[in-house]
């Protein structure tokens, strides 16, 4: 299974699109700024397994494709960079779950790392709470939109050592 | 290693054009924004502008607009500020710095090493 | 624009003092403050973000408080290499403003 590489392909294609998707002047919504509480310890240890690891990287990528497929995400970003986004997540979940299927017949460990699951669900807790708050604005979205870019960029850097450690 | 390099002294008689640069190095350079900063001799730290080089957007403080170009080349991870007509008052040391965007990071984390800029007849 | 008013502009001290320097917002900037030291001929060097937030390799000595339009760095031990200007800056909204700065100076 060679998820690591194909996922930062993946990844890289996300990033580009996220990118793309922006619509007001960033340099607007600076007040906007909020400390999510990206769990990065979660990112950091390396007493993962690889079925582990890529349970955490599967959550983050699913509750992802969640908060861009709700009806105020459509409303707010251009419909066919949004549909574009959302298959190219869409692609990596189903990658990584025939992944994970492959690697557990491999490793004798449990499947999922609860914890680390439960701290990626808590963080897009706080991301929707956040732009719950906020009445779904424009710059409600830039901010998220900043947000996830940057942790799908930290979450790279997991990546890169999975696939180091193979 | 993050390091932002900045081009050299420059000594200029009022009227000429300049542009100095400042190039990112050790990080995702299109993550961060850059902005730029003026100290004359002897006195404070003044926010001038700053470029987002992702999409080259630019934002300036009202007293610098429309007396400096701010711009970015992302392919070479290099940020410039430029004069089209310098003045006496221009002289000064400027620094550029990096800025983590909307995101909840430290602001102006790295600077550059500064460029001094003087102008002379 | 919003102001940013530091004080005092000057300060003398010795080694071990302990030093406080404020800083003013003109209005309201919840959190959105900086404090950055600066030795002569240097570039700036962040040493607080988000008011209280102790950056990297800043040594913990240096610490921030204050929300709103009121701010506050602390030195508790002055040392040494701590001599220098400090400026206060606010990031909440643009234009990006600093203080006039503070210079610590030897008793």
């Known amino acids: 299974c060679d998820l690591p590489q194909t996922h930062s392909l993946g990844n890289r294609r996300a990033l580009i699109l996220l990118a793309q998707m922006g619509r007001i002047s960033p340099f607007s919504c600076l007040k906007d700024r909020h400390d999510f509480g990206f769990p990065q310890e979660e990112f950091d240890g390396n007493q993962f397994q690889k079925a582990q690891a890529i349970s955490v990287l599967h959550e983050m990528i699913q509750q992802t494709f969640n908060l861009f497929s709700t009806k105020d995400s459509s409303a707010t970003w251009e419909q066919s960079l949004l549909e574009k986004f959302s298959t190219e997540l869409n692609q990596q979940l189903n990658d990584m779950e025939a992944c994970v299927i492959q690697e557990v017949g491999v490793e004798e460990t449990p499947l999922m790392n609860v914890d680390s699951i439960l701290a990626v669900k808590k963080y897009f807790q706080r991301i929707t709470l956040y732009l719950t708050e906020k009445k779904y604005s424009p710059c409600a979205w830039e901010v998220v939109r900043a947000e996830i870019m940057r942790s799908f960029s930290l979450s790279k850097i997991f990546q890169e050592r999975l696939r180091r450690k193979e | 290693e993050v390091q932002l390099v900045q081009s050299g002294a420059e000594v200029k008689k009022p009227g000429e054009s300049l542009k100095i640069s400042c190039k990112g190095s050790?990080?995702?350079?299109?993550?961060?924004?850059i902005g730029w900063v003026r100290q004359m001799p002897g006195k404070g730290l003044e926010w001038m502008g700053i470029?987002?080089?992702?999409?080259?957007?630019?934002a300036y403080s009202p007293s610098f607009q429309g007396q400096v170009t701010i711009s970015a080349d992302k392919s070479i991870s290099t940020a410039y500020l430029q004069w089209s007509s310098l003045k006496a008052s221009d002289t000064a040391m400027y620094y550029c710095?990096?800025?983590?965007?909307?995101?909840?990071?430290?602001?102006?984390?790295?600077w550059g090493q500064g460029t001094l800029v003087t102008v002379s007849s | 624009d919003i102001q940013m008013t530091q004080s005092p502009s000057s300060l003398s001290a010795s080694v071990g003092d302990r030093v406080t320097i404020t800083c003013r917002a003109s209005q309201s900037i919840d959190r959105a403050l900086n404090w950055y030291q600066q030795k002569p001929g240097k570039a700036p060097k962040l040493l607080i973000y988000?008011?209280?937030s102790l950056q990297s390799g800043v040594p913990s000595r240096f610490s921030g408080s204050g929300s709103g339009t009121d701010f506050t760095l602390t030195i508790s031990s002055l040392q040494p290499e701590d001599f220098a200007t400090y400026y206060c800056?606010?990031?909440?909204?643009?234009?990006?403003?600093f203080g006039q700065g503070t210079k610590v100076e030897i008793k």
């Open positions: 710095a990096r800025h983590p965007g909307l995101n909840w990071a430290p602001d102006f984390d790295y």
């Open positions: 988000f008011a209280s």
């Open positions: 800056q606010q990031s909440f909204d643009f234009p990006l403003t």
């Open positions: 470029i987002d080089p992702s999409d080259s957007d630019t």
């Open positions: 050790g990080y995702s350079f299109t993550s961060y924004w």
